[in-house]
């Protein structure tokens, strides 16, 4: 007995063949002996069976011995052995119907769990194995379990049922909503304009929801709300912005928000938060300030700088053009009487510069 | 835990003053913004004004402008609403709320203080 | 100034039953509405911000919906302690408004 598997909702072609290649009476009945279709002189007539709407034959193959019955929507309970009577023999096809669906909406915010469970007919026991965009196998029986979902699970998951030593192929499409980064960090000098971006790792038809940037500066001792957005169909207008910073917000996505100068006040950490109209849960951005600010105040040239730094970056003074150079893991570095020229303070990570403030020494006489 | 605590309530003749106070614990209170929401006996909710956290940025309901100021102390945790000229219409509960979340809803309430303007 | 014009004023219910709450503001707040509960006596709880999204330790019971002008709260099987005043807020621009309230009462 020939075994086929078929997907739920789709069409599958079940073959029959008679040895001439002539057209010839035909009959396909279900395992109840109940007839689905056949020919009656020239014409396709359909039994009585509940598949009789769904079932069709290629009429253009008869004259060449293949009576195939192709069955439309394909729905689990279609599963059941078919018999095709030609030619005084009996040929009899297997099918086995399979359905995969994601349990929830298949748009699911990072972290999210997502559950895939199959369909399948009684009797059966089949095996599922997954592979997801990023390369990653997760194996089941009836239902598979991705307990967290990352940036990289989006896209086209890619299923196999096996079943009798053969296969089905399912695709499922995921959208895993998340910013582009989990965290990002600006570096700027005392004054300049400062622009903070949150691209979206996913694009939606209809977006809409709200959101909030809440600040933690280095110097302050709580953090506040610093704006308060709506996202109404990818249109961002601002509901509430502090006055200190006066923060400027982007109308149209991606997010993006404008410090008007950076001062070692703002530095610090912020987390953007984002929540979707009909979702449970938020999108998290973490976003950081780095001030840097260089001196000279009497004999003493000062570098510093403000904000979440890793230990293992270097503050260093250094004049250019000679080798005079003061480097420290530290906040803060300075020369005492420097000499007179361009100093340059260089905030750096192995050897890459992060950020660059220059500052000129004249001479005292 | 979150405890917000009004006091100041009490009788006064209308064209008088009043001050309620509200106390707040268990959160960051120069975090957020507060609000003050009155209730007349028997009647429905009305939102009277808010301030930021900074205290630099109010809002006032119409019919309050001009005679209520709303203002905080953050070193004291504290909440005020200083009401002048007080009309007859101005009896109620005054309940003071924190401002939290994205969607700007009023998450924790105080139990309330009672003004009533009567002569 | 928004208004919000809550319906019905008042609803008597059975423990159990489903009870529906609307609420119409007279101009597009997005989902910048909020819902409460309040108990005679009490201070109002906060149940549910931006339309739909549930407090944290507010029953599953409790659901909002709608976005723009319409919106709806939803007690699905009605308990009862649920029985109390609701109101609707937007929080879209000031004044904030609020609805005038819908009592729920034992039938």
């Known amino acids: 007995k020939k075994v086929v598997l078929g997907k739920k909702g789709d069409t599958v072609e079940l073959t029959c063949n008679a040895s001439q290649k002539k057209n010839t009476q035909f009959h396909w009945k279900n395992s109840n002996q109940i007839k689905i279709l056949g020919i009656q002189g020239l014409f396709l007539t359909k039994g009585p069976s509940k598949l009789s709407d769904r079932a069709d034959s290629r009429k253009s193959l008869w004259d060449q011995g293949c009576f195939s019955m192709i069955i439309k929507n394909l729905k689990i309970e279609d599963s059941d052995t078919y018999i095709c009577e030609v030619e005084n023999k009996k040929e009899e096809v297997e099918l086995l119907v399979f359905g995969l669906t994601a349990n929830s909406d298949t748009h699911l915010l990072e972290g999210q769990s997502l559950t895939l469970t199959l369909e399948s007919p009684p009797g059966s026991s089949p095996s599922v194995k997954c592979r997801s965009p990023g390369g990653k196998n997760i194996q089941g029986g009836r239902t598979i379990s991705v307990p967290q979902l990352e940036r990289q699970d989006s896209g086209t998951w890619t299923c196999t049922v096996s079943q009798d030593q053969k296969t089905v192929e399912f695709k499922i499409d995921i959208v895993v909503l998340a910013f582009q980064k989990a965290s990002s960090t600006v570096y700027k000098k005392e004054g300049e304009q400062v622009e903070f971006s949150f691209p979206l790792a996913f694009t939606l038809e209809k977006l809409t929801g709200s959101g909030e940037l809440w600040w933690q500066a280095e110097r302050a001792s709580s953090s506040k709300s610093w704006i308060t957005f709506d996202l109404k169909n990818k249109e961002v207008s601002v509901k509430r912005v502090t006055q200190d910073p006066k923060l400027q917000m982007g109308k149209k996505l991606p997010l993006h928000l404008t410090l008007p100068q950076a001062l070692p006040q703002y530095a610090g950490s912020g987390n953007l938060t984002l929540a979707l109209e009909a979702k449970t849960g938020k999108l998290h951005q973490e976003v950081n300030l780095v001030v840097m600010r260089a001196t000279q105040f009497q004999e003493n040239l000062t570098c510093e700088v403000w904000g979440p730094t890793s230990p293992k970056l270097t503050l260093s003074l250094k004049l250019e053009n000679k080798g005079a150079t003061v480097s420290k893991q530290a906040k803060a570095v300075w020369v005492l009487n420097p000499e007179a020229g361009m100093w340059q303070c260089l905030l750096s990570d192995s050897g890459q510069v992060l950020l660059e403030s220059n500052i000129k020494v004249v001479p005292t006489w | 835990e979150v405890q917000l605590v009004e006091s100041g309530g009490g009788l006064v003749q209308p064209g008088g003053s009043l001050r309620l106070s509200c106390a707040a614990s268990?959160?960051?209170?120069?975090?957020?913004?507060m609000s003050w929401v009155r209730q007349a006996p028997g009647k429905g909710l009305e939102w009277v004004a808010n301030?930021?956290?900074?205290?630099?940025?109010?809002y006032y309901v119409d019919s309050v402008k001009g005679r209520f100021t709303i203002s905080r102390d953050n070193a004291k945790n504290s909440l005020f609403l200083q009401m002048n000229s007080l009309r007859a219409e101005d009896t109620a509960v005054y309940y003071c709320?924190?401002?939290?979340?994205?969607?700007?809803?009023?998450?924790?309430w105080g139990q309330g203080a009672l003004v009533t303007v009567s002569s | 100034d928004i208004q919000m014009t809550q319906s019905p004023s008042s609803v008597s219910a059975s423990v159990g039953d489903r009870v529906t709450i609307t609420c119409r503001a007279s101009?597009?707040?997005?989902?910048?509405l909020a819902w409460y509960q309040q108990k005679p006596g009490k201070a109002p709880k906060f149940l549910i911000s931006?339309?739909?999204s549930l407090q944290s330790g507010v029953p599953s019971r409790f659901s909002g919906s709608g976005s723009g002008t319409d919106f709806t709260l939803t007690i699905s099987s009605l308990q009862p302690e649920d029985f109390a005043t609701y109101y609707c807020?937007?929080?879209?621009?000031?004044?904030?408004?609020f609805g005038q309230g819908t009592k729920v009462e034992i039938k």
């Open positions: 101009q597009g707040i997005s989902s910048w």
């Open positions: 807020q937007q929080a879209n621009s000031f004044p904030w408004t």
């Open positions: 709320a924190r401002e939290g979340g994205q969607w700007l809803a009023l998450d924790y």
């Open positions: 268990g959160f960051t209170f120069s975090s957020y913004w």
């Open positions: 301030i930021n956290q900074d205290g630099n940025e109010k």
């Open positions: 931006g339309a739909s």
